[in-house]
């Protein structure tokens, strides 16, 4: 047995005399031999769920449904109950209704076995009949709402009338009927006014029914037509199966390059016509399980539920559905000399479904993790200024296929051939495995001697200790030209184009700081800037050279504070500025500003 | 606050070693560099040594080369100054100062400790 | 290295008088110039760098000019806080040099 609503409302005047019938609950059948029986709670609530008093005004027919007024609630009783109220004015009173036998403690009220009852308080007695508006004759102030289990015996859930109404107005006249097209699974009996269903509803096919409810009220000569919106909701229980889409119940999956922990190898997907369990239930009541097969395959991958509420057409309407992604993930990072193939086997159980038919199923992954072998091309040829600062990036090294690896650590190493010349480091880049090439001593980079540089590049996968080698030859470039000491270290520091451009700053590949003129469009990503190589500064990124020394581009990675129009990066820098952004290292400190009209560039752009 | 403060001076003989130190707080000293500047008595100011942010560059006026080592530990918020083989011509108060990559002058100064080098 | 001459060496003025110090380096230094103050027994205090740029907290009073070779330091109106000796400092190249200084006096 459930309710088919878990709320109604009704309205209570002072002195309104005992007897005087209320309004109607109504129970759905779950099965067609249980017989509805209905109790109140013992109290009335108030405010904020206080308990204000014993119930000793309102009954209930426990067979029929019907609560109406025991003894007339006079001003006395009233102010006793607004008394208990923690000083609010009270202006709504609630009752719990139980079904019987449901044994619920009095203190919870769930629907669908406890519904509650609300009435709105009026300090006054029940007005005069002709003063009653049509829409107050016809229908509550709130409107109802109904629920109705799909696969259930049909029944009775709503009666139309106000009950006060009739009782205290018995000369005026008011019909009802409900608005629905054809073949709808709802009638209004004409003489009780009572809304049932014609057959059990599958929501499968429906899941909401929005009716129109019609109310036509006669007083004498008048003739007066009232409607309000009557939605039906069904409820939904696991009576579908769950299916794959297309047919489809195999992935076949290669792992090569991405051998990351929490890759996701394949994806199967699973329908099912329900959107019940709920989610909180459903990864319990709705299991995946890898089947045994051999030990590595069980410690190698395992299986993700992501299911997720989906719409799909029936009838002409849409109603919910769930779709279950079944994901084959990586459980550990794979070493690059694994090499295997296996067929793995998931059994999908929706363990609420009670038939008919099974609501089991079995996907099949089809696996091959295929080994990868380092290579790098024989021979790497780059170019350097001899005027490039410390930490300026002149180039990347990478093993063939390496911006496509996730889960494989190779780390980069130089070897020179002159002890004296050793001018490049290399440190890995962690966003796609590559070797970025930074200049690391800018003295050997002055030596004549120094004008070609050999370095054998070392690529080694840290798991396996596995190699790739190549030939490096850096030719150096252009004649060296002092900085000037009072240059700021970073070019960061300048805030005009001119300043900028005539100093160098760590960073530097020509020795030189570049501008970045933004496009001065509010805050953007897009801010004017001064920068050792606009290429990688800024970016929004703080990479792993950059990460060496805040003086390099503080833009991307400065963790103190930045000062005006501004959207701070993730984690750290500048993600958006307003104007020009400089900043002061040392200081932890980043300005961002409107453009600075002064500049003699401005001038001349002017002209 | 911002704040420099040596120590190790006194009277050493002619060609002894002695180590000045700066004490820093109040501002993140790993990010500034470091310089010592002296002041014989009567005399004008004269730059000694600087030293980088993280200790990777040094710069000496000609007179102390190859006798003074400049050094910083950053962990302590401190500079040093070894002073070796020292000449009566090396008598002065000796003033630490902080000089920031943005700027390179010398903005936050100590309040000076005195060597004397005499026999 | 980058020599600085100052001049005057000695400069007498009263409260209120605009006086005005000269730097001269011997070959060109851009603006990589500043100017301290030092009264005796104490440390020196940075006033103006990057030629004309006044150090926050310095009164206005105090200003910087020039580039390249020549540098003057003036001061407005003389203020009895004022009576001290100045330098001028290049830092063009890591040889930071400063001048001899000015002593400025009481008339």
């Known amino acids: 047995l459930y309710f088919s609503r878990d709320a109604y409302w009704e309205k209570l005047y002072v002195d309104q005399a005992a007897g005087t019938p209320l309004l109607y609950v109504h129970a759905l059948r779950d099965a067609p031999e249980e017989v509805p029986s209905f109790r109140l709670g013992q109290h009335l609530y108030g405010t904020y769920r206080t308990r204000l008093h014993e119930n000793n005004w309102i009954c209930i027919q426990e067979d029929t449904g019907l609560l109406y007024l025991n003894r007339s609630l006079d001003h006395s009783s009233w102010e006793k109950l607004s008394v208990r109220n923690r000083g609010f004015p009270l202006l709504t009173v609630y009752l719990k209704v139980f079904l019987s036998p449901t044994s619920l403690r009095e203190g919870e009220c769930q629907w669908p076995g406890c519904a509650r009852v609300y009435f709105s308080f009026f300090n006054t007695s029940f007005p005069a009949c002709s003063s009653l508006k049509p829409r107050e004759l016809c229908f509550p102030e709130t409107r109802p709402s109904f629920r109705i289990r799909e696969n259930r015996p049909p029944g009775t859930f709503h009666q139309f009338r106000l009950l006060p109404v009739q009782f205290l107005c018995p000369n005026i006249s008011v019909a009802y009927r409900l608005l629905e097209g054809e073949g709808l699974p709802f009638r209004c009996a004409p003489d009780s006014l009572e809304v049932s269903t014609r057959w059990a509803l599958d929501r499968e096919q429906r899941e909401k029914y929005e009716l129109v409810a019609v109310c036509t009220v006669h007083a004498g000569a008048r003739e007066e037509v009232v409607m309000v919106p009557f939605p039906v909701t069904v409820y939904d229980e696991d009576d579908s199966a769950p299916t794959f889409p297309a047919g489809v119940d195999t992935a076949s999956a290669v792992v090569e390059f991405k051998r990351k922990e929490d890759t996701v190898v394949a994806t199967l997907r699973v329908f099912d016509a329900d959107v019940v369990p709920a989610s909180g239930e459903l990864v319990r009541r709705y299991t995946s399980t890898l089947l045994p097969g051999d030990t590595w395959a069980q410690q190698t991958f395992r299986v993700e539920h992501w299911p997720n509420e989906t719409s799909v057409q029936a009838n002409g309407s849409f109603v919910r559905a769930t779709v279950h992604d079944y994901r084959l993930v990586l459980n550990r990072n794979l070493s690059i000399s694994e090499n295997r193939t296996m067929q793995l086997a998931v059994l999908v159980n929706d363990s609420d479904f009670q038939g008919p038919g099974a609501g089991v199923l079995l996907l099949h992954f089809n696996v091959s993790v295929l080994p990868v072998s380092l290579h790098l091309p024989s021979t790497y040829s780059l170019s350097v200024s001899r005027r490039a600062r410390r930490f300026a990036q002149i180039g990347k090294v990478c093993v063939e296929n390496c911006q496509a690896f996730s889960g494989i650590n190779v780390q980069y190493k130089l070897h020179s051939s002159g002890a004296n010349c050793s001018t490049l480091g290399v440190v890995t880049s962690a966003e796609d495995t590559s070797g970025i090439l930074f200049v690391n001593d800018t003295k050997a980079l002055r030596r004549p001697k120094c004008a070609e540089l050999h370095y054998m590049v070392v690529a080694t996968d840290q798991q396996t200790s596995r190699q790739a080698q190549a030939q490096l030859l850096v030719t150096v470039e252009g004649s060296y030209v002092a900085e000037e000491a009072g240059c700021p270290l970073s070019c960061a520091v300048s805030k005009r184009r001119l300043e900028c451009e005539e100093c160098g700053g760590l960073g530097s590949p020509t020795g030189r700081c570049e501008w970045r003129q933004g496009d001065g469009k509010g805050i953007t990503r897009n801010f004017s800037t001064c920068s050792p190589s606009t290429k990688t500064c800024p970016d929004g990124h703080c990479d792993v050279v950059e990460t060496q020394d805040i003086n390099i581009c503080p833009q991307d990675c400065l963790r103190g504070s930045i000062v005006g129009g501004h959207e701070p990066g993730e984690p750290r820098g500048i993600k958006a500025g307003y104007g020009t952004c400089n900043c002061f290292p040392e200081e932890e400190k980043c300005f961002c500003e409107p453009e600075d009209i002064q500049d003699p560039l401005c001038d001349e752009l002017c002209r | 606050q911002v704040q420099l403060v040596e120590s190790g001076g006194g009277v050493v003989q002619p060609g002894r070693s002695l180590r000045l130190s700066c004490a820093a707080s109040?501002?993140?000293?790993?990010?500034?560099?470091m310089v010592w500047v002296r002041q014989a008595p009567g005399k004008g100011l004269e730059w000694v040594a600087f030293?980088?942010?993280?200790?990777?560059?040094?710069y000496y006026v000609d007179a102390v080369k190859g006798r003074f080592t400049i050094s910083r530990d950053n962990s302590k918020n401190t500079l040093y100054l070894q002073m070796n083989s020292l000449r009566a011509e090396d008598t002065a108060v000796y003033f630490c100062?902080?000089?920031?990559?943005?700027?390179?002058?010398?903005?936050?100064w100590g309040q000076g400790t005195m060597v004397t080098v005499s026999s | 290295d980058i020599q600085m001459t100052q001049s005057p060496s000695t400069l007498s003025a009263s409260v209120g008088d605009r006086v005005t110090i000269t730097c001269r380096a011997s070959?060109?230094?851009?603006?990589?110039l500043a100017w301290y103050q030092q009264k005796p027994g104490k440390a020196p205090k940075l006033l103006i760098y990057?030629?004309?740029s006044l150090e926050s907290g310095v009164p206005s009073r105090f200003s910087g000019s020039g580039s390249g070779t020549e540098f003057t330091l003036t001061i407005s109106s003389l203020q009895p806080d004022d009576f001290a000796t100045y330098y001028c400092q290049q830092y063009n190249s890591y040889s930071y040099t400063f001048g001899q200084g000015t002593k400025l006096e009481i008339k």
């Open positions: 109040g501002f993140t000293f790993s990010n500034y560099g």
């Open positions: 100062a902080r000089s920031g990559p943005s700027r390179h002058v010398f903005d936050i």
């Open positions: 990057k030629a004309s």
């Open positions: 030293i980088w942010y993280d200790g990777s560059d040094k």
């Open positions: 070959q060109s230094i851009s603006s990589w």
